[in-house]
């Protein structure tokens, strides 16, 4: 269920859940918001100061990288 994630616990969870995609500590500008002036929401606000489930955590994963063929 939802839990608070701070410090190393938060980095661990992001690393494991996001994997190859990597992650953001702040959502990119405009991510999930129609207003360019909306304040940036940070994962520390959402997951450390408040409880955070896995789906919320996944919102901070970076987009899929378009990998080039080797």
């Amino acid at each position: 269920g939802p839990e608070t994630l701070c410090g190393a616990e938060l980095v661990d969870a992001l690393q494991f859940v996001c994997g190859d995609r990597g992650f953001y500590f702040n959502k990119p500008t405009g991510y999930g918001s129609s207003s360019r002036r909306a304040p940036q929401t940070g994962i520390v606000d959402e997951c450390c100061f408040r409880s955070c489930d896995l789906r919320r955590l996944e919102m901070y994963c970076a987009p899929l990288k378009p990998a080039k063929s080797a």
């Epitope: 994997g19 190859d20 899929l64 990998a67």
Partner: antibody, heavy 118, light 106 residues
Framework: EVHLVESGGGLVQPGRSLKLSCAAS????????MTWVRQAPTKGLEWVAY????????YYRDSVKGRFTISRDNAKSTLYLQMDSLRSEDTATYYC???????????WGQGTLVTVSS | EIVLTQSPTTMAASPGEKVTITCRAS?????MHWFQQKSGTSPKPWIY???KLASGVPDRFSGSGSGTSYSLTISSMEAEDAATYYC?????????FGAGTKLELK
Amino acid sequence: EVHLVESGGGLVQPGRSLKLSCAASGFTFSNYYMTWVRQAPTKGLEWVAYISSGGGSTYYRDSVKGRFTISRDNAKSTLYLQMDSLRSEDTATYYCTTEDYGYWFAYWGQGTLVTVSS
Amino acid sequence: EIVLTQSPTTMAASPGEKVTITCRASSSVSYMHWFQQKSGTSPKPWIYGTSKLASGVPDRFSGSGSGTSYSLTISSMEAEDAATYYCLQRSSYPPTFGAGTKLELK
């Protein structure tokens, strides 16, 4: 050198419990998140559970949620998997694993076999 | 979750033969990773990030691909390459492995 040694496997009846252990050495255990991965006989690999470095965060595959509990004792450098309400489909070799960023599932123990049968 | 389908399931190759194992993902992934497992032993990391060989892996191995289609290639089969190979994706939670390709020596 990273060394992971699992123990606690064996034959158990459906519905019963078993607790697996994984003794870690050769690295700073408390700095790393840990996972369990299992492999059913003659089958592929399946991630089972995750626990953060401090033990405060856990994730499970859907089929074991509510039945399995992953935990750790950083003072003893030991990882655990408590398995309750065991089913025949839980029969597998269970591996303790850890990883570095980008080097996924880099380190594996030798595995411990759990057989669930009446 | 992303399903990884490996092909072939089993195959046999003669020494010196070129071998290609494929892994197809049900959705696009950034990279594919490969593991080698020999009977009675733990899986070993073999190829990371689609094409980077893990430490100690012979350079006759290579990896390639993008999107939903990836492959592991052995340029010239040797006896020690007989094993089961698994692909892994870490682009989407939860992590998932392919069912494996068993490579035998002919």
